[in-house]
């Protein structure tokens, strides 16, 4: 019979329940915002905001300074005091809505939910490798802010995203805020605005450009700003908003808004719908054409990509790509398919689609009925007309007004549904060597570090570990500090190495040494670790072979047995070709001669499972004793593979040498035509891999084999006669003299 090694699931080579402890900081309240600073003189800091407090941490996450940011009206509020004697507004807690660095100065800017959403500028004072905050500047000039026109009212209690850009000698704040009717009526924050920080840090210059949801839509049309970033000549905001001003407001989709980073103008404000789908390789019956839509963006991050992913996305290495985690709806619960999907949108492609959309709107011939869109911000109009106007006047340009691009940008899940039930709540993408890694936080407080590739049917994990014991969701915003990422979960900030927290979750030497170079994993005799964990025995160049099973478990003391060994690190080459003299198998004292691979039996093994097979012919030595013994595989002088060479010995117990004994045969006669069912009784009749019952030298076809009994059908006889009957096990005759008599039919 053709025995095959059982497959070992790929997951068996790793253990994601391994506990990793990473540095952390307890902030004393739910973390509301976090940002990092790295100076050019080796000084660095982590700024962590909770309700009514701003913490300054050193690079080791130890507290350096703490500043009271509220409650407003409380004499202990240190930021409030910077605005001079109050009262400045209704008293109340300060929830930090904005925490950003002004890179030009550099300085930290914080804006809260109290005091009309005003901001504070905190000068950074390097002190060795740490940073302190100087006394805050109140970015609010009382005399030029009114409820209906307030350049210094920045943060909305419903959420605000800010990206700071240096233009010329000034810092411009690109601000996007979620509004409703109540918020809009109170000191008039705007949906999207570009505000210049005045040189004297007394606030923002009046007369700034802005777009706001029109009053009639404020009740039903809410825009959530999920992420903002600056790359190249543009600032981008990512939003989740109703797909239509007129239809069901709960039908949401995701948009990208693009603003010029070189001109503080909103005439070239553009929006583009981002469409992310899960398109399984085999489509279920009833599944939508083009894949299942995942319209709601949960988190996003943009980063330059490594060579491999760049090739898959048909872009150049190092090009900026926007990555987004999408879900099916606000609650995140899917019907069928994974909970979260990840789509990749190359920035250059986004820009091209936007520019083509502008051409379609503004270059003749314009498709009739093509709408300018953004009816929640501006009066409806058809291209190429400006908002609210029937036609272009000679001194206006179609291009100088905001526009929703008429086509969407559609992509499919990079992970092909493999995130399954995981609910991703945080995302940061890095390029390590030529590998692009997604660092993801989850709803249940885990960190997943996974290579971003689209061509596989399994996930390539750098790590998958729990941040702590609380199991609280990892928050959306992630910051980088040197070679670490900072994730927040509950009231804690965690510092996770970009290279992964360690290597102990890789259980086998092969998996360990196949890990990415940047992880710094090596084998320490019986575990995978980084060099600092086991400096004495740590090595990265070889793995011993690993025997996990063999077949059969017994063989005849006389005669050969075809032994199949199962395990890993036998070959390192898919072909399984073994150079002469590299593999030595012994069973007890007896050698087992390697057999060439039977190419007809080679079967592709998906990387999700792995198993290696090795076959050899066991011919026991004359000195070999009956009884249990070990199987030993030694590999030496193997040419190195891509990741390591195989070198070493693996021993497995449980093989027994046995002597088959034939005790009885019946019946001892039968028709000359053959077909008599012979029963051979004895002991150890099933040992080894081959046996044959010979009647007058012709094989008696075996029907059943067991340890104590063989059944076979006799072949036809040439003549009526008594003929010799023998049993061979492993090609060697079992002692005993038996005859079978052919009779007339």
């Amino acid at each position: 019979e053709d025995w095959q090694c059982p497959r070992t699931p790929y997951a068996a080579s790793r253990d994601f329940d391994v506990k990793y402890v990473v540095p952390s900081f307890s902030a004393g309240g739910l973390v509301q915002a976090m940002v990092t600073y790295e100076g050019d003189r080796n000084e660095s800091a982590v700024f962590v905001a909770i309700r009514n407090r701003l913490h300054v941490l050193g690079p080791d996450l130890k507290s350096v300074q703490s500043l009271a940011t509220g409650p407003a009206g409380d004499p202990g509020c240190q930021t409030c005091a910077a605005c001079g004697p109050g009262p400045h507004g209704p008293p109340g807690d300060t929830d930090t809505k904005v925490l950003v660095l002004d890179p030009a100065l550099p300085a930290l800017v914080s804006c809260g939910s109290s005091l009309q959403g005003r901001c504070f500028l905190h000068d950074l004072e390097p002190q060795g490798t740490a940073v302190h905050l100087a006394a805050p500047a109140c970015l609010f000039s009382a005399h030029h802010n009114r409820p209906d026109d307030c350049p210094d009212c920045v943060a909305s209690p419903l959420g605000t995203r800010v990206t700071v850009v240096e233009q010329g000698q000034a810092s411009y704040f690109y601000v996007a805020s979620s509004l409703d009717a109540a918020v809009a009526a109170s000191f008039s924050p705007r949906s999207v605005s570009i505000r210049r920080l005045k040189a004297d840090a007394s606030g923002f210059a009046p007369g700034f450009v802005a777009l706001s949801v029109l009053p009639k839509h404020l009740v039903s049309y809410s825009i959530e700003y999920v992420h903002s970033f600056h790359t190249g000549a543009f600032v981008y905001f990512l939003t989740v908003q109703p797909a239509s001003v007129t239809d069901d407001p709960s039908a949401l989709h995701t948009r990208l808004a693009r603003l010029s980073a070189t001109e503080p103008e909103l005439g070239d404000y553009r929006e583009l719908v981002l469409d992310c789908r899960f398109a399984p390789k085999r489509r279920r019956r009833g599944a939508p054409e083009g894949g299942q839509p995942y319209p709601v963006l949960r988190v996003a991050h943009s980063a330059p990509v490594g060579a491999q992913l760049a090739t898959e996305l048909s872009i150049a290495e190092g090009q900026e790509v926007l990555f987004g985690v999408f879900v099916t709806g606000k609650d995140g619960g899917p019907g069928v398919g994974p909970n979260s999907v990840v789509c990749a949108f190359p920035i250059d492609l986004l820009d091209t689609l936007i520019d083509e959309g502008v051409e379609r709107c503004c270059e003749s011939p314009v498709h009739p009925g093509l709408r300018r869109g953004l009816d929640f911000f501006q009066s409806p109009s058809f291209c190429p007309n400006p908002p609210g106007l029937e036609a272009l006047s000679p001194n206006t340009s179609c291009r100088h007004f905001p526009l929703l691009v008429s086509s969407s940008f559609s992509r499919v899940d990079l992970f092909n549904g493999l995130l399954g039930p995981v609910q991703v709540t945080a995302l940061y993408v890095t390029r390590l060597d030529n590998v692009t890694v997604a660092h993801m936080g989850t709803m249940d407080g885990r960190i997943l570090q996974v290579e971003l590739v689209r061509s596989l049917n399994y996930l390539l994990y750098v790590s998958n570990f729990s941040l702590g014991d609380s199991g609280q969701p990892v928050q959306r915003d992630v910051s980088r500090l040197g070679d670490h990422l900072l994730f927040a979960s509950g009231d804690q900030v965690f510092q996770v190495p970009i290279q992964g927290p360690g290597c102990r979750h890789f259980l086998t030497c092969g998996r360990c040494l196949r890990a990415w170079h940047f992880m710094g994993c090596g084998w320490c005799g019986n575990m995978c670790g980084q060099q600092k964990e086991c400096p004495g025995s740590w090595q990265q160049d070889h793995c011993p072979p690993k025997l996990t099973e063999f077949h059969p478990h017994s063989g005849p003391l006389r005669g050969s047995t075809r032994l199949t060994l199962c395990g890993s690190n036998f070959y390192l080459h898919p072909s399984g070709l073994v150079p002469e003299g590299t593999h030595q198998v012994t069973v007890g004292q007896s050698p087992c001669r390697p057999l060439p691979k039977d190419s007809s039996k080679l079967r592709p093994v998906p990387r999700k499972d792995f198993v290696e097979e090795f076959e050899c012919e066991l011919e026991p030595l004359g000195t070999q004793a009956v009884g249990p013994t070990n199987v030993s595989l030694t590999v030496t002088n193997m040419p190195p593979g891509k990741h390591f060479r195989v070198d070493g010995t693996s021993v497995l117990r449980g093989f027994s040498f046995m002597e088959p004994v034939l005790i009885a045969v019946q019946p001892l006669f039968g028709p000359r035509a053959g077909g008599t069912c012979l029963t051979l009784e004895g002991q150890s009749l099933s040992v080894g891999t081959s046996r044959a019952v010979l009647v007058n030298g012709t094989e008696c076809l075996l029907a059943r084999v067991s340890e104590g009994q063989l059944l076979c059908a006799t072949p036809p006889g040439a003549t009526v006669a008594s003929v010799p009957l023998s049993l061979q096990v492993g090609g060697a005759q079992v002692p005993g003299s038996w005859t079978f008599q052919y009779r007339e039919d």
């Epitope: 100076g39 550099p106 000068d123 950074l124 109140c138 000698q169 004297d200 007394s202 210059a205 009046p206």
Partner: antibody, heavy 121, light 107 residues
Framework: EVQLLESGGGLVQPGGSLRLSCAAS????????MEWVRQAPGKGLEWVSY????????VYADSVKGRFTISRDNSKNTLYLQMNSLRAEDTAVYYC??????????????WGQGTLVTVSS | DIQMTQSPSSVSASVGDRVTITCRAS??????LAWYQQKPGRAPKLLIY???SFHTGVPSRFSGSGSVTEFTLTISSLQPEDFATYYC?????????FGGGTKVEIK
């Protein structure tokens, strides 16, 4: 007591270079933004250059951009102005001035007594 | 760049007089304006910042007002030590710029 003492002025030929220094004392120099302001003989004040407390941001008047470089050494409590490709119109008394910390507003709350730079052949 | 235009360029007045100096910005600077006093051979001294806030130790006869583009410095009752040149400076955006100065002379 806050003190700012400029030095390094003098006579220089057109096209030449000069480096002005401003030694600060009586306050934590690294906490403050600093600037240079000049005054040509018998003329008004002209703002020249600004440097942020950390030295991260520098700004120049158009008239000196590309020729002058402002810098600071916080460990030595000193502000510098490197002046290259000097012209006759750069002749002036150069004042070093301290700006209040961010938290107040950018107005010069302390000035040095000035150092005279004369550019002439 | 923001141009600052000061007027008059000079004014003759007597002790006890009320003197008003105007400063106009070429574009809106809200209240980002400072006033300085300079005596011959001396460094300038800060009088007013943020258009109307007194610097420490400045006598109350000096006051500043105005916003956006129009600003004034008023000396309510001129004293002998007030004869000097006065400069305005905008602090709204870089490059920071000064007005041309107003010389207050003894009549």
């Amino acid at each position: 007591e806050v003190q700012l003492l400029e030095s390094g002025g003098g006579l220089v030929q057109p096209g030449g270079s000069l480096r002005l220094s401003c030694a600060a004392s009586g306050f934590t120099f690294s906490d403050y933004q600093m600037e240079w302001v000049r005054q040509a003989p018998g003329k008004g004040l002209e703002w020249v250059s600004y440097i942020y407390s950390s030295g991260g941001k520098t700004v120049y008047a158009d008239s000196v951009k590309g020729r002058f470089t402002i810098s600071r050494d916080n460990s030595k409590n000193t502000l510098y102005l490197q002046m290259n490709s000097l012209r006759a119109e750069d002749t002036a008394v150069y004042y070093c001035a301290r700006l209040p910390r961010v938290g107040a507003t950018i107005i010069n709350d302390y000035w040095g007594q000035g150092t005279l730079v004369t550019v002439s052949s | 760049d923001i141009q600052m235009t000061q007027s008059p360029s000079s004014v003759s007045a007597s002790v006890g007089d009320r003197v008003t100096i105007t400063c106009r910005a070429s574009r809106g600077i809200s209240s980002s304006l400072a006033w300085y006093q300079q005596k011959p051979g001396r460094a300038p001294k800060l009088l007013i910042y943020a258009a109307s806030s007194f610097h420490t130790g400045v006598p109350s006869r000096f006051s500043g007002s105005g916003s956006v583009t129009e600003f004034t410095l008023t000396i309510s009752s001129l004293q002998p030590e007030d004869f000097a040149t006065y400069y305005c400076q905008q602090t709204d955006s870089f490059p920071l710029t000064f007005g041309g100065g107003t010389k207050v002379e003894i009549k």
